[in-house]
C-alpha cells in the first residue's frame, strides 16, 4: 500500500507512517514502529502538557511568586497549568497574571462603581448630583446627600461631589 501523506486526528506522520500522538499529561519518548505503538511517558511532578502532542518535554507549571503578590488560585495537574491570582488588595497586571499591583482607590468626588477582584482593578465613577464621596477609598460608593427635609431641617450649605449638605434648624417665624 501507498505510504500515507496525511493522518487522522490525534496522529502524526513520521517515517511514512501514522503514529498516535501522546495524550494530555504525557510526553513523546519514542515514535511508533511497524510493530509497536508510540511510547509516551507521564509528565513529572510540577510539569504538564494540555493537548494531544508529540512534545519531547513537558512544560513547567507556572510559579506564583509571593514576592510579586501572587498566590495559587488553582494547583496545576499533569494536564493543566497552575492558575495564579493576587493577594487580597491586589490585582493582576495582565491576563497571564504574571505580577500584581495594588488596587486603585477612588479619589474624593469619585465613588467605587465596581470593587476590584484578583484579576481586575477598581472601577471609579464621578459622584453625580445628589451624591458625594469625601474619602479616597477602594470600597466606598458615592453616598447620597443627607435629606434635610426628612429631619425637619433645612439646607444651610449646599452639597458638592466631595461634601455632604449641611443641615440646620428652620428659621422661627416671628410673631
Amino acid at each position: 500500500p501507498e505510504p500515507p501523506t496525511a493522518c487522522r486526528e490525534k496522529q502524526y506522520l513520521i517515517n511514512s507512517q501514522c503514529c498516535s500522538l501522546c495524550q494530555p499529561g504525557q510526553k513523546l519518548v519514542s515514535d511508533c514502529t511497524e510493530f509497536t505503538e508510540t511510547e509516551c511517558l507521564p509528565c513529572g511532578e510540577s510539569e504538564f502538557l494540555d493537548t494531544w502532542n508529540r512534545e519531547t518535554h513537558c512544560h513547567q507549571h507556572k510559579y506564583c511568586d509571593p514576592n510579586l503578590g501572587l498566590r495559587v488560585q488553582q494547583k496545576g495537574t499533569s494536564e493543566t497549568d497552575t492558575i495564579c491570582t493576587c493577594e487580597e488588595g491586589w490585582h493582576c497586571t495582565s491576563e497571564a497574571c504574571e505580577s500584581c499591583v495594588l488596587h486603585r482607590s477612588c479619589s474624593p468626588g469619585f465613588g467605587v462603581k465596581q470593587i476590584a477582584t484578583g484579576v481586575s482593578d477598581t472601577i471609579c465613577e464621578p459622584c453625580p448630583v445628589g451624591f458625594f464621596s469625601n474619602v479616597s477609598s477602594a470600597f466606598e460608593k458615592c453616598h447620597p446627600w443627607t435629606s434635610c427635609e426628612t429631619k425637619d431641617l433645612v439646607v444651610q450649605q449646599a452639597g458638592t461631589n466631595k461634601t455632604d449638605v449641611v443641615c440646620g434648624p428652620q428659621d422661627r417665624l416671628r410673631a
Partner: antibody
Framework: EVQLEESGGGLVQPGGSLRLSCAAS????????MSWVRQAPGKGLEWVGT?????????DYASWAKGRFTISKDTSKTTLYLQMNSLRAEDTATYFC?????????WGQGTLVTVSS | DIVMTQSPSSLSASVGDRVTITCQAS????????LAWYQQKPGQAPKLLIY???TLPSGVPSRFSGSGSGTDFTLTISSLQPEDFATYYC????????????FGQGTKVVIK
C-alpha cells in the same frame, strides 16, 4: 532498513576507558529515546542508562553507572555513544544499544567489551 | 531503586504445555503498566515480546499474553512451541529521574 549497529568494543585494561558507538538508520533518531543495556557472559540483562529525545538530551543512569559512564548522541550523525571510564573486570559484557526508554522496540546485535590485564 | 524479582529462574516444559512466569516489582511501575517482557535466544539480541504489561507487538504470536498491574505481572505462553525455548526477562520502568529501568534475573525455559 530500520537498524542499530554497535561498534567500539574490545579488550581494555582495568582503569582504562572506551567509547562505544551505535549507528542508527531507518528512523527519525531525533525524536526517540535511546538506551544502553549490557549482559555479562552467561548472565542476565542489565540496564545502563537512557538518553531522552529532544534538544537538551536529558540522561538517566543506573546508580552503579553514574559518574563512570556517560551517554551522548550526535543527531546529525544519527549515532549514540557510551563513554566508559575507570573500567573494572565486572564491566566485561556485551553492550547493546536499544530504542526506547520504558520498553525497547529495537536492539542492536551488541559489542563485546572485555576488561582484563 | 526498583528491583524486579522473576520466578521461576528456570523451568522445564514440553511442547504444548501452558507456561506461566511471574514478575514482581519492589514498587509500582509508572502508570501501573510500564512493564515489558523480552525473549532472548543464545547469541542473539533480546526481542520485545510484550509491552505496557499486556500489549503484543504486531508479529508476536497470540499464544503469548501478559497481565498484571502495579507490582505484580505475569507472562503466559498458552501452548509452548519448539521455537519458544529461550530465556525470558521482565523489565519494569520506574521513572526518568529515579533509576529508570530494571530487569528481572531471567527465566530459562528448557525442554523437558
Amino acid at each position: 532498513e530500520v537498524q542499530l549497529e554497535e561498534s567500539g568494543g574490545g579488550l581494555v585494561q582495568p582503569g582504562g576507558s572506551l567509547r562505544l558507538s551505535c549507528a542508527a538508520s531507518g528512523f527519525d533518531f531525533s525524536s526517540n529515546a535511546m538506551s544502553w543495556v549490557r549482559q555479562a557472559p552467561g548472565k542476565g540483562l542489565e540496564w545502563v542508562g537512557t538518553i531522552y529525545a529532544g534538544s537538551n538530551g536529558n540522561t538517566d543512569y543506573a546508580s552503579w553507572a553514574k559518574g563512570r559512564f556517560t551517554i551522548s548522541k550526535d543527531t546529525s550523525k544519527t549515532t549514540l555513544y557510551l563513554q566508559m571510564n575507570s573500567l573494572r573486570a565486572e564491566d566485561t559484557a556485551t553492550y547493546f544499544c536499544a530504542r526506547g526508554a520504558s520498553y525497547f522496540t529495537l536492539w542492536g546485535q551488541g559489542t563485546l567489551v572485555t576488561v582484563s590485564s | 531503586d526498583i528491583v524486579m524479582t522473576q520466578s521461576p529462574s528456570s523451568l522445564s516444559a514440553s511442547v504444548g504445555d501452558r507456561v506461566t512466569i511471574t514478575c514482581q516489582a519492589s514498587e509500582s511501575v509508572v502508570s501501573n503498566n510500564r512493564l515489558a517482557w523480552y525473549q532472548q535466544k543464545p547469541g542473539q539480541a533480546p526481542k520485545l515480546l510484550i509491552y505496557l504489561a499486556s500489549t503484543l507487538p504486531s508479529g508476536v504470536p497470540s499464544r503469548f499474553s501478559g497481565s498484571g498491574s502495579g507490582t505484580d505481572f505475569t507472562l503466559t505462553i498458552s501452548s509452548l512451541q519448539p521455537e519458544d525455548f529461550a530465556t525470558y526477562y521482565c523489565a519494569g520502568y520506574k521513572s526518568s529521574s529515579t533509576d529508570g529501568t530494571a530487569f528481572g534475573q531471567g527465566t530459562k525455559v528448557v525442554i523437558k
